[in-house]
């Protein structure tokens, strides 16, 4: 279990305003049993961008279909890009616990740039 | 095994409460999004109400927002529906079912349903 | 809100047959759809979860496919304990909805 690794390939994306971002990360196995965080910053101010166990984000689709019982790619697809979207995304796997789910391994993070709009 | 138990329905003024609950066993309750979901005699199916594991996200159908209310009690494995201002509209049988960590799991277990009549 | 729409509302099928019941959705869901059986007086059960997933416990009978806008439901050769009311429903976005069901009777 020791051994999961979260691979986030891409050190940084550059993205023009009002395109799509896709921000990818896969896990290299199914244990520890948990859910998948995307998170933009990092510590205690860090922003949540997308929970795979609770609640709907309108901006954000999963690359793959993530019901998949032997699913492992978590990428996502950030829909129409802002310059305010600007950042270092990390992709975290948590470890599934009680009462709650404990952070088990982060990806290195991707730097997620925005360009100008082309006109 | 998993076991979905409603409970609380009956026969109801328009206007008047009624509290529904849902007793949950066989699996890990704090793992599950609940839903609520109802069907009105010889109709289809009508989701109501969903709660996150953690009660983070709560969503409800616009036919009752603001009278309906959503709720669950992980230590006690009991999920809720307290339904104010009922009409005769809101009769149905009332199901709860579970969902698997996020919004775009299926409903895998659901309940046998109670039945609620609103009527004069 | 995303509509779902399936076809036939009703369905008269003998036993063996193969049966092939849609569901067609205002807008793409992506492979978010899921079906469901409910017979007379119980509650709905899950059969196939996201377009062509069978659950735990289904017969291989059933199977599901689609994408997008478009999914089917199959039974490749009914059986007695088959014949019930059949639903779609979207997980895509909120709020969740479901078809308004398919009735399938013994011919």
């Known amino acids: 279990e020791e051994g999961l690794q979260v691979i986030q390939p891409d050190k940084s994306v550059s993205v023009a305003a009002g395109e799509s971002a896709i921000l990818h990360c896969t896990a290299t196995s199914l244990i520890p049993v948990g859910p998948i965080q995307w998170f933009r910053g990092a510590g205690p101010g860090r922003e949540l961008i997308y929970n795979q166990k609770e609640g709907h984000f309108p901006r954000v689709t999963t690359v793959s279909d993530l019901t998949k019982r032997n699913n492992m790619d978590f990428s996502i697809r950030i829909g129409n890009i802002t310059p305010a979207d600007a950042g270092t995304y990390y992709c975290v796997k948590f470890r599934k616990g009680s009462p709650d789910d404990v952070e088990f391994k982060s990806g290195a993070g991707t730097e997620l740039s925005v360009r100008a709009k082309p006109s | 095994q998993v076991q979905l138990v409603e409970s609380g329905g009956g026969v109801v003024q328009p206007g008047r409460s009624l509290r529904l609950s849902c007793a949950a066993s066989g699996f890990t309750f704090s793992d599950y999004g609940m839903i609520w979901v109802r069907q009105a005699p010889g109709k289809g199916l009508e989701w109501v109400a969903s709660?996150?594991?953690?009660?983070?996200?709560?969503y409800y159908a616009d036919s009752v927002k603001g009278r309906f209310t959503i709720s669950r009690d992980n230590s006690k494995n009991r999920l809720y529906l307290q339904m104010n201002s009922l009409r005769a509209e809101d009769t149905a049988v009332y199901y709860c079912a579970r969902r698997y960590y996020g919004f775009n799991y299926p409903f895998d277990y659901w309940g046998q349903g109670t039945m609620v009549t609103v009527s004069s | 809100d995303t509509q779902l729409t399936q076809s036939p509302s009703s369905l008269s099928a003998s036993v063996g047959q193969r049966v092939t019941i849609t569901c067609g959705a205002s807008?793409?869901?992506?492979?978010?759809m899921h079906w469901y059986q409910q017979k007379p007086g119980k509650q709905p059960k899950l059969l196939i979860y996201?377009?062509?997933n069978l659950e735990a416990g289904v017969p291989s009978r059933f199977s599901g496919s689609g994408s997008g806008t478009d999914f089917t439901l199959t039974i490749s050769s009914l059986q007695p304990e088959d014949f019930a009311t059949y639903y779609c429903?979207?997980?895509?976005?909120?709020?969740?909805?479901f078809g308004q069901g398919t009735k399938l009777e013994i011919k």
């Open positions: 709660i996150s594991s953690s009660s983070s996200y709560i």
């Open positions: 429903q979207q997980s895509n976005e909120p709020p969740y909805t």
């Open positions: 807008k793409s869901v992506r492979t978010y």
């Open positions: 996201s377009a062509s």
